[in-house]
């Protein structure tokens, strides 16, 4: 009984299509695969950023796989051929591993790369990124931002830079069609006549960095002798009501501070008839049903009632 063997895939490589971190892992079928023509040969692929403790593992019949990586670090991957037990009259047969690595040769020292990169997707409409120049770089250093997400043919450069002292320190992005709920890749590189500048790579999803506008139209309504309903409206813009969480800050008679987080555009407050002054502010944030993270909006304008019986009227700002 001869032992069944299978070769590893050929030409295993990581291909960078220029998408700033979204890479292709590709390979060719093993040599002598024709002996297993009636079989569905599979490949087990393992890959990770160098320094990561865990491998991602994929089993596929294809000759390619795509995923996003952090190009600030290297990438390592390995693959082997799997012959299912149906092909071998017994146990699964595996080839030896084929291995490959990929990294972008770094230029410049780490300190030259941009510092404190911060990106905010304002009201789920306008993306703005800002940064500080690298440590010790000269004024002739300029930084350029490139971005890509699935749906773009190629990486695009920022066309509307925010400048300070002639240097690019941020980017106002154009309308980004169909760009949420997918990885958004950014590279900020730089040039200087003085010394090479290190590139920086960033990946995030836009829905997770949304900063909404604050809520509007804050109102009071007396519900009963000891209950006041606070109401407000969702901010203008594309974010649906179901996507908001709110934080309310309420001050009664300048002494009691109440804070609460709610999911609806109302909050019922227990009060006494002696309440002489009531003020509240609200801010909004995209909730867990629409994103994994978010940024609180600014506080709304303050809405106050002072020195008048709340039972007699509704106060509208």
């Amino acid at each position: 009984d001869t032992e069944i063997k299978v070769n590893p895939p050929q030409d295993f490589e990581i291909v960078d299509p220029g998408y700033l971190g979204y890479l292709y892992l590709q390979w060719q079928p093993p040599l002598s695969l024709d002996h297993f023509k009636e079989c569905t040969v599979e490949y087990e692929l393992k890959y990770r950023n160098i320094g990561s403790e865990t491998w991602k593992t994929i089993i596929t019949k294809n000759l390619h796989y795509k995923d996003g990586f952090d190009l600030n670090k290297g990438i390592e991957a390995k693959i082997h051929t799997l012959l299912p037990w149906q092909c071998t009259n017994g146990s699964e047969v595996q080839s030896s591993w084929a291995e490959t690595t990929y990294w972008i040769s770094p230029q410049g020292i780490p300190e030259t790369k941009v510092q404190d990169m911060d990106c905010v997707y304002y009201n789920w409409q306008y993306l703005l990124c800002s940064w500080k120049p690298g440590i010790g770089v000269l004024l002739d250093t300029n930084y350029n931002l490139f971005y890509w997400y699935e749906g773009l043919d190629h990486a695009l450069q920022c066309v509307d830079y925010i400048k300070a002292d002639g240097q690019n320190i941020g980017c106002r992005f154009p309308y980004l069609e169909a760009s949420d709920y997918k990885d958004f890749y950014i590279c900020v590189n730089g040039s200087s006549e003085n010394k090479p500048i290190r590139s920086s790579y960033f990946t995030f999803q836009l829905q997770n960095i949304v900063k909404p506008l604050p809520p509007v139209y804050l109102t009071f309504t007396r519900e009963s002798s000891c209950e006041i309903k606070l109401k407000w409206s969702i901010p203008l813009g594309p974010i649906p009501a179901r996507c908001f969480d709110y934080e309310i800050e309420i001050r009664e008679d300048d002494t009691t501070l109440v804070t609460a987080t709610v999911e609806n555009e109302t909050y019922t407050l227990k009060t006494t008839n002696e309440t002489r002054q009531l003020c509240f502010v609200v801010r909004s944030k995209v909730n867990i049903y629409c994103s994994d993270d978010g940024i609180w909006s600014e506080w709304s304008d303050k809405q106050c009632w002072e020195g008048e019986d709340l039972s007699k009227k509704t106060l509208l700002r």
Epitope: E13, Q26, L31
Partner: antibody, heavy 122, light 107 residues
Amino acid sequence: EVQLVESGGGLVQPGGSLRLSCAASGFTFSRNGMSWVRQTPDKRLEWVATVSSGGSYIYYADSVKGRFTISRDNAKNSLYLQMSSLRAEDTAVYYCARQGTTALATRFFDVWGQGTLVTVSS
Amino acid sequence: DIQMTQSPSSLSASVGDRVTITCKASQDVGTAVAWYQQIPGKAPKLLIYSASYRSTGVPDRFSGSGSGTDFSFIISSLQPEDFATYYCQHHYSAPWTFGGGTKVEIK
């Protein structure tokens, strides 16, 4: 439409150099290995060189090893063949060819360009 | 290197004829053999790969068979547009070599 268009051929003296280019369109260029295949005046086909999809793996025929360099630029959808120390026996029509890939097989050529003629003569 | 010996080097046939071309590899190449058609003044065109798999859009009058070292290419009913030169090629391991070609001419 899948298309390969070669350019850069011409008349060159023995010992001279020439650079062939191949512009690809109509497919995801970075997904396929690419090759140069030549056809000699007696109509024989000879595989010259192959570069893998990402450019990490390169193969040459013994007859051109050390003299020819195959390369690719996936951003420009282009394949190149830098030929130096040319000899009379390198005279041929040079075809750019896409490496076909199926789950079971590879290294056959499923798309060919129209060819560019290289004549090495004094 | 694996040599591919193709025969005959030329043949004459009529429209409607069945044509068989053979190719012999100098060593076992499994089923890694492709067949190409070249019309004068044009680039070669892939017809068959992996010995018996037709390329996309290739008419079913073209077929291939064989494994190991002996391979056959058949045109079941020759059509006017089939008068051309046919080449075999092994796609087993580098260097990938071609047969010398078979010119199919009108009788």
